[in-house]
């Protein structure tokens, strides 16, 4: 049974599935948004497309106490090869430029849909 247990446990999620699930989560957030997302918190914007997952996580991880994006934060961490903690600042961010979390999530959704259509799952 111990050996057979390995067959029952889920294997690694294919990148295409992980990206689709992240897109679905962002769709949920944008569609179910009633009050200002995360009380209108502001996050660092991004000015490049390379290394985008880590940069997006580095921005969003600085938003605390916002349950609406906690799942997104966890999902993004699965795409980022290194550990990200609050306060990190990537060269991908636009210094002194912040945008609302709601806009960030909306734009992230747009970008991920493009990546999905282009077959860029990593």
């Amino acid at each position: 049974l111990t050996c057979l247990g390995g067959f029952a446990s889920p294997g690694p999620v294919p990148p295409s599935t992980a990206l689709r699930e992240l897109i679905e989560e962002l769709v949920n957030i944008t569609q179910n948004q009633k009050a200002p997302l995360c009380n209108g918190s502001m996050v660092w914007s991004i000015n490049l497309t390379a290394g985008m997952y880590c940069a997006a996580l580095e921005s969003l991880i600085n938003v605390s106490g916002c349950s609406a994006i906690e799942k997104t934060q966890r999902m993004l961490s699965g795409f980022c090869p290194h550990k990200v903690s609050a306060g990190q600042f990537s060269s991908l961010h636009v210094r002194d430029t912040k945008i609302e979390v709601a806009q960030f999530v909306k734009d992230l959704l747009l970008h991920l849909k493009k990546l999905f259509r282009e077959g860029q799952f990593n």
Epitope: T49, K106, L110, H111
Partner: nanobody
Framework: GVQLLESGGGLVQPGGSLRLSCAAS????????MGWVRQAPGKGLEWVSS????????YYADSVKGRFTISRDNSKNTLYLQMNSLRAEDTAVYYC???????????WGQGTLVTVSS
């Protein structure tokens, strides 16, 4: 909120050049396809040119092909339109706008007036 601010318009003689700029803020400019649209006095809106998010693909209306060049600098959140060999028929208000098919991603600037006259 989202802002697109055009600049660089003005009065220029036929055959002259102008460079329009569009400074973007409040959204992730680097992830958007962008474009320029113009409206001549008393006429409807006319698409001029567009560029994809990474800047590698550009598109032009036949009326400006070979004379206008669209470009972008994602590090500066800025879109450009270099206009050469200007003609009287290029006189219009030029608007910077996002160029996305997705509903809800439609953002426009206030426009900048270009007048080509001798």
């Amino acid at each position: 909120g989202v802002q697109l601010l055009e600049s660089g318009g003005g009065l220029v003689q036929p055959g002259g050049s102008l460079r329009l700029s569009c400074a973007a803020s409040g959204f992730i400019f680097a992830w958007y396809d962008m474009g320029w649209v113009r409206q001549a006095p008393g006429k409807g809106l006319e698409w001029v040119s567009s560029i994809n998010d990474k800047g590698g693909k550009t598109y032009y209306a036949d009326s400006v092909k070979g004379r206008f060049t669209i470009s972008r600098d994602n590090s500066k959140n800025t879109l450009y339109l270099q206009m050469n060999s200007l003609r009287a028929e290029d006189t219009a208000v030029y608007y910077c706008a996002t160029a996305e098919d997705e509903p809800g991603y439609d953002y426009w600037g206030q426009g900048t007036l270009v007048t080509v006259s001798s």
